[in-house]
């Protein structure tokens, strides 16, 4: 049986059940290389409290559909008096990056995971030439996830003192320049994740090969190498390589630019101080507030919730968007879709789409940007579920009793963007994490 998601095959992936202190290793096409789980384990569970290993999915006992992968075992389990077998179930959804498998829950018999990934899309519009896993768990099983830094088009400019060259990078995947026909970036060779431009020439100095690594707490490393044989004439016989070290800052701060810290014989070392390198619980909340010692800040957007069936309305030219954030109030237009953001076509108000659901909510504060994300909306033709990204700005003089109002700013590939100036986005900082 052919592997269902070939892009995911090259790596062993990790997921964590934080509540029970369990680390899962997943290899969806072969077996994980862990002796204690046996030679054919596709999903290996490591219980860190009891220091035991169990195979909870066998690569030989795999069954697959387009959106579900199940690995059975021969191990019996007791579920409500019936004799079942232990199994793992991975539900796949379309995403814009390779993404990460997320542990959902486990019963006596079944270990459930969910994975939003380009590999599950109906169309190839989000697929990279080359992409590697962009997250890692540290020794305390805390997740560090750089997926939000991945650019689907364009690149980051590396701060370099050399006026004659420009070094462009992407994070964990190659640079897509197709949407910018006029700039220097256009000359970058396909597949490159680190592109050096000198004059009118552009050179591939690195492609992603291995996934993100953690070198020590709050320091993550990504390495790019030039795969192609043949040396560049300005590299003194060496093969180019790029090492990007992502550093979690010791306290809250605005984002910084990736900086070139060393360069010799086409070996480029880049340091990027960014809060995205911090563990995810420091940056994100599933509620509408971020507070407490762990986050170093106090943010509470819950006063923006609308009561009594009313919604915020944002005009999107062809569409009207109805928003009801930070609550579970149904938007009247949205046909019981549990939508936090509802898109209604002006010319045909029967055309209604959920552009993100209120139980699929993430509040993120990172590098000085406060963002509320609603995902899991109605599917687009690519298979991607509509989502909304609301970028908040602090405005102490916002109208509507300080609440302000969301403004639709654009749509790209079924992601809807809004900005929202409000006094409730004014962040109160504590110190040190």
């Amino acid at each position: 049986q052919a592997a269902p998601f070939p892009e995911l095959c090259s790596y062993t992936w990790e997921a964590v059940d934080t509540k029970n202190n369990v680390l899962y290793k997943i290899n969806i096409c072969g077996s994980v290389d862990i002796v204690q789980c046996g030679p054919s384990s596709a999903v290996c569970m490591h219980d860190l409290d009891t220091r035991t290993y169990h195979s909870v999915g066998d690569s030989v006992l795999r069954s697959a559909t387009r959106s579900l992968l199940e690995f059975n075992t021969t191990v019996s389990c007791d579920q409500q008096g019936t004799n079942h077998r232990v199994q793992s179930s991975i539900a796949f959804l379309c995403g814009k990056t390779l993404g990460t498998p997320e542990f959902v829950t486990a019963t006596e018999c079944v270990h459930y995971f969910e994975w939003r990934t380009t590999a599950a899309c109906k169309k190839d519009i989000f697929k990279a030439n080359k992409e590697v896993p962009c997250y890692v768990f540290d020794e305390e099983l805390r997740k560090h996830d750089l997926n939000p830094l991945i650019k689907l088009s364009g690149a980051y400019l590396v701060d370099d003192s050399d006026p004659d060259t420009s070094l462009f990078i992407n994070v964990c995947r190659d640079i897509d320049t197709l949407r910018d026909p006029g700039s220097q970036l256009r000359a970058c060779p396909p597949g490159t994740a680190a592109c050096l431009v000198r004059g009118h020439q552009a050179f591939d100095v690195g492609q992603p090969r291995d996934g993100l690594k953690v070198v020590r707490k709050d320091r993550l490393v990504l390495s790019y190498v030039r795969e192609e044989a043949g040396k560049l004439d300005f590299c003194d016989g060496h093969s180019p390589a790029v090492t990007i070290t992502f550093v979690c800052p010791s306290e809250r701060r605005e984002g910084t630019i990736p900086k070139l810290t060393a360069k010799s014989n086409c070996r480029y070392e880049i340091e990027w101080i960014t809060e995205y390198a911090c563990h995810r619980d420091y940056l994100e909340s599933k509620t509408c507030s971020l507070s407490g010692e762990q986050q170093d800040v106090s943010i509470d957007l819950t006063p923006l919730a609308q009561s009594g069936g009313s919604s915020y309305i944002s005009d999107g030219k062809e569409y009207l968007f109805y928003l009801n954030v930070c609550g579970e109030t149904e938007i009247q237009f949205c046909n019981k879709k549990q939508a936090a953001v509802c898109q209604v076509k002006k010319s045909d108000t029967s055309q209604v789409k959920a552009a993100g659901r209120y139980h699929n909510q993430t509040l993120r504060y990172s590098d000085g940007d406060l963002t509320l994300i609603y995902f899991g909306g109605d599917e687009c033709s690519s298979g991607f579920q509509r989502m909304s990204v609301i970028n908040f700005e602090c405005n102490k003089t916002a109208g509507n009793d300080g609440k302000g109002t969301p403004v639709f700013t654009g749509e790209v590939d079924c992601t809807y963007f809004f900005t929202w100036d409000t006094e409730y986005a004014c962040v109160h900082h504590h110190h040190h994490h």
Epitope: G154, A155, Y156, S166, D180, G182, G368
Partner: nanobody, 123 residues
Framework: QVQLQESGGGLVQAGGSLRLSCEAS????????WGWFRQAPGKEREFVAA????????SYADSVKGRFTISRDNAKNTIYLQMNSLKPEDTAVYYC????????????????WGQGTQVTVSS
């Protein structure tokens, strides 16, 4: 690709003010960085100010800091350059540009450009 159209240039006395506008059309969210540049006769095109579309993060050339302010109105897909305390050396053609490169002020990294609007500051 995005199309850009500037307006608001003109003749003004030293110490006066002008507000330039730049309206963007096309798939504006595929660009992340919006900039104003200027070019005086016989000189290279130089960076003036930049703003990111998804947030209010801004950067300025040292020569205009404290006098010029870049802003945006997402609802109108428009960016602005408010120019106060104008000096004769601010005389130039001002261009609006868009880039898919983050953290750049280099004009060669901007792939989309407007036609420019003339600003003349008399003493």
């Amino acid at each position: 690709q995005v199309q850009l159209q500037e307006s608001g240039g003109g003749l003004v006395q030293a110490g006066g003010s002008l507000r330039l506008s730049c309206e963007a059309s096309g798939r504006t969210f595929n660009t992340y960085n919006w900039g104003w540049f200027r070019q005086a006769p016989g000189k290279e095109r130089e960076f003036v100010a930049a703003i990111r579309w998804s947030s209010s993060k801004t950067s300025y050339a040292d020569s205009v800091k404290g006098r010029f302010t870049i802003s945006r109105d997402n609802a109108k897909n428009t960016i602005y350059l408010q120019m106060n305390s104008l000096k004769p050396e601010d005389t130039a053609v001002y261009y609006c540009a868009a880039s898919i490169v983050d953290f750049t002020t280099n004009p060669s990294h901007f792939g989309s450009w407007g036609q420019g609007t003339q600003v003349t500051v008399s003493s």
